[in-house]
């Protein structure tokens, strides 16, 4: 059974992941540039199911495409450093899902824009945090 300290650590990591994703989404929403239109043309795979920490495998597999899209947004008005940001998220995701479990991600048939993708994973984090609070 999970100890209170491990639950607390999980909650903190989820809160950090949530903040990271919210920061990215806020940056994109604030981005007034033709580049934004181009960013929205990129398609992301969405998980068929995302209710457990093991489903973060689906997020991990989309981090490289996410970094590539964010690289488009580099300007003095977009205050994200994609490599640092994605690296930070990757560390959190690996710790949360556990590196020893092998889970094959199942994706939904429909792809999504970066905004829909981020909102989906933000909702995932919020949902799990709510069960831990």
């Amino acid at each position: 059974a999970p100890t209170s300290s491990s639950t607390k650590k999980t909650q903190l990591q989820l809160e950090h992941l949530l903040l990271d994703l919210q920061m990215i989404l806020n940056g994109i929403n604030n981005y007034k540039n033709p580049k934004l239109t181009r960013m929205l043309t990129f398609k992301f795979y969405m998980p068929k199911k995302a209710t457990e920490l093991k489903h973060l495998q689906c997020l991990e597999e989309e981090l490289k495409p996410l970094e590539e899209v964010l690289n488009l947004a580099q300007s003095k008005n977009f205050h994200l450093r994609p490599r640092d940001l994605i690296s930070n998220i990757n560390v959190i995701v690996l710790e949360l899902k556990g590196s020893e479990t092998t889970f094959m991600c199942e994706y939904a048939d429909e792809t999504a824009t970066i905004v829909e993708f981020l909102n989906r994973w933000i909702t995932f984090c919020q949902s799990i945090i709510s069960t831990l609070t």
């Epitope: 919210q22 920061m23 640092d84 690296s87 919020q126």
Partner: antibody, heavy 113, light 107 residues
Framework: QVQLVQSGAEVKKPGASVKVSCKAS????????MHWVRQAPGQGLEWMGI????????SYALKFQGRVTMTRDTSTSTVYMELSSLRSEDTAVYYC??????WGQGTLVTVSS | DIQMTQSPSSLSASVGDRVTITCRAS??????LAWYQQKPGKAPKLLIY???SLDSGVPSRFSGSGSGTDFTLTISSLQPEDFATYYC?????????FGQGTKVEIK
């Protein structure tokens, strides 16, 4: 638990910049994402933005984008908030807060010619 | 941006009174709502997080309820040290936004 201590009050001329510091102690600095919130005299609370202290990246409220810069120095466990092109409406108390349960004491910035 | 609307903007009450402050979000924020108390010249103090969870060290006379768009902060029996301004805040999405505040004054 982390404690936050902010720099002292500042008086600035319109058009100038101000840099407010927030020093964290008592816990692992990189575990605490830092928000900045300001409060004009007699007014409510206004979120300015957030910095991830580990990676150093930031996200700002649209109202402040282009005028605000948040940075951190991991060697001194300090985060900074710099606001440029100051105007009288920027006269406010500026707070740093981590996790919303720990706040700095506030820094009064007065913009006056 | 999500707008947070508090009511009333001010109220007068006596020690021992039951006080209720409401907060309405312009869209559903689930339970991603916090309540703060602020006294003049001081930083805000977190009272309630996740709509109904009491922060450590906060007296049990404070309670929060609600989900979705409508939330309530209740002080079951007002004490002299409770006269202050109270703010609600959503952290469901960025930008984080606050209510305009409710000032609780002595009748």
């Amino acid at each position: 638990q982390v404690q936050l201590v902010q720099s002292g009050a500042e008086v600035k001329k319109p058009g100038a910049s101000v840099k407010v510091s927030c020093k964290a102690s008592g816990d692992t600095f990189t575990d605490y994402y830092m928000h900045w919130v300001r409060q004009a005299p007699g007014q409510g609370l206004e979120w300015m933005g957030i910095i991830n202290p580990r990676a150093g990246y930031t996200s700002y409220a649209l109202k402040f984008q282009g005028r605000v810069t948040m940075t951190r120095d991991t060697s001194t466990s300090t985060v900074y908030m710099e606001l440029s092109s100051l105007r009288s409406e920027d006269t406010a108390v500026y707070y740093c807060t981590s996790g919303w349960d720990v706040w700095g004491q506030g820094t009064l910035v007065t913009v006056s010619s | 941006d999500i707008q947070m609307t508090q009511s009333p903007s001010s109220l007068s009450a006596s020690v021992g009174d039951r006080v209720t402050i409401t907060c309405r979000a312009s869209q559903s924020i689930s339970t991603w709502l916090a309540w703060y108390q602020q006294k003049p010249g001081k930083a805000p103090k977190l009272l309630i997080y996740a709509a109904s969870s009491l922060d450590s060290g906060v007296p049990s006379r404070f309670s929060g309820s609600g989900s979705g768009t409508d939330f309530t902060l209740t002080i079951s029996s007002l004490q002299p040290e409770d006269f202050a301004t109270y703010y609600c805040q959503q952290s469901y999405s960025f930008p984080v936004t606050f209510g305009q505040g409710t000032k609780v004054e002595i009748k």
